[in-house]
Amino acid sequence: LTCLGGFASPGPVPPSTALRELIEELVNITQNQKAPLCNGSMVWSINLTAGMYCAALESLINVSGCSAIEKTQRMLSGFCPHKVSAGQFSSLHVRDTKIEVAQFVKDLLLHLKKLFREGQFN
């Protein structure tokens, strides 16, 4: 067997694959959750039909020190065309409701599964 690791950069992930990988990571989080996710941290609820990826990142990026969602934060940063920093709320037009991270993840997962089923990979 030949090991090619490190020699060739992997090709860009097609949108459908990228979306599936994000769904798989969110499934992972919900299934492996034992204690309250991120110690029960609260984040802004988002409108899942309006510029969802950047808005989701803007909400979740304000949770620090929670290893369980670090991969999700990283993945979402690749799903947003502009750079998002903690405390930035450009895509989060309405900030009126806070929910627990666990609920946020569940809501996002349900919506992404629906998009995937409908073939909306954009």
Partner: antibody, heavy 118, light 109 residues
Framework: EVQLVQSGAEVLKPGATVLISCKVS????????MHWVQQAPGKGLEWMGR????????KYAPKFHDRVTITADTSTDTAYMELSSLRSEDTAVYYC???????????WGQGTLVTVSS | QAVVTQEPSLTVSPGGTVTLTCRSS?????????ANWVQEKPGQLFRGLIG???NRAPGVPARFSGSLLGDKAALTLSGAQPEDEAEYFC?????????FGTGTKVTVL
């Protein structure tokens, strides 16, 4: 004043590699993604990829992913785009452009003409 | 890979209104495509006009507005000025990469 200043025109042979620089001023380099765009003669625009100068994380367009490398040097506030295995159809003007939510593609370099000819 | 198409050319009278559209081959354009509009004038730097579907870039006149129109992204120019004569490109975000549209040449006549 925000400025993006690119390196000069290049004439190269097929198979060669070109490295274009984009030196920025007037803002904090690491605060924004830098994108690169190609415009071939008489053609439209093609997005090539982008970099987060803070950590070097990149995204590339499917068309270019195996030949393009985007890097950033935070010590000089300069982004670089390297395109390898050049062919005649890579003859184009290449642009760096800053992108953010409030200023989408708001600032552009002056462009660098790359001519690939044997 | 998606293809993003625009009207090749449109003509508008000075003071008139024109709407440019941007269609995706993969289906309806949504807010998660973060539609962008860029202006190109000969001999000048490109200029970003609109991002995130409807956010005007700083310094862009209010006569330029972005929206979703049916299943497409749209750029509406209300009260066209002679200096608005240019090529306009849209760009749509597909989860992890942009694809630019074919471009629309707008003539103010």
């Amino acid at each position: 004043e925000v400025q993006l200043v690119q390196s000069g025109a290049e004439v190269l042979k097929p198979g060669a590699t070109v490295l274009i620089s984009c030196k920025v001023s007037g803002y904090t380099f690491t605060d924004y993604y830098m994108h690169w765009v190609q415009q071939a003669p008489g053609k439209g625009l093609e997005w090539m990829g982008r970099i987060d100068p803070e950590d070097g994380e990149t995204k590339y367009a499917p068309k270019f992913h195996d030949r393009v490398t985007i890097t950033a040097d935070t010590s000089t506030d300069t982004a670089y785009m390297e395109l390898s295995s050049l062919r005649s159809e890579d003859t184009a003007v290449y642009y760096c452009t800053r992108y953010d939510y409030y200023g989408p593609f708001a600032y552009w370099g002056q462009g660098t003409l790359v001519t690939v000819s044997s | 890979q998606a293809v993003v198409t625009q009207e090749p050319s449109l003509t508008v009278s000075p003071g008139g209104t024109v709407t440019l559209t941007c269609r995706s081959s993969t289906g309806a354009v949504t807010t998660s495509n973060y539609a962008n509009w860029v202006q190109e004038k000969p001999g000048q730097l490109f200029r970003g006009l609109i991002g995130g579907t409807n956010n005007r870039a700083p310094g862009v006149p209010a006569r330029f507005s972005g929206s979703l129109l049916g299943d497409k992204a749209a750029l509406t120019l209300s009260g066209a000025q002679p200096e608005d004569e240019a090529e306009y490109f849209c760009a749509l975000w597909y989860i992890n990469h942009f694809i630019f549209g074919t471009g629309t040449k707008v003539t103010v006549l």
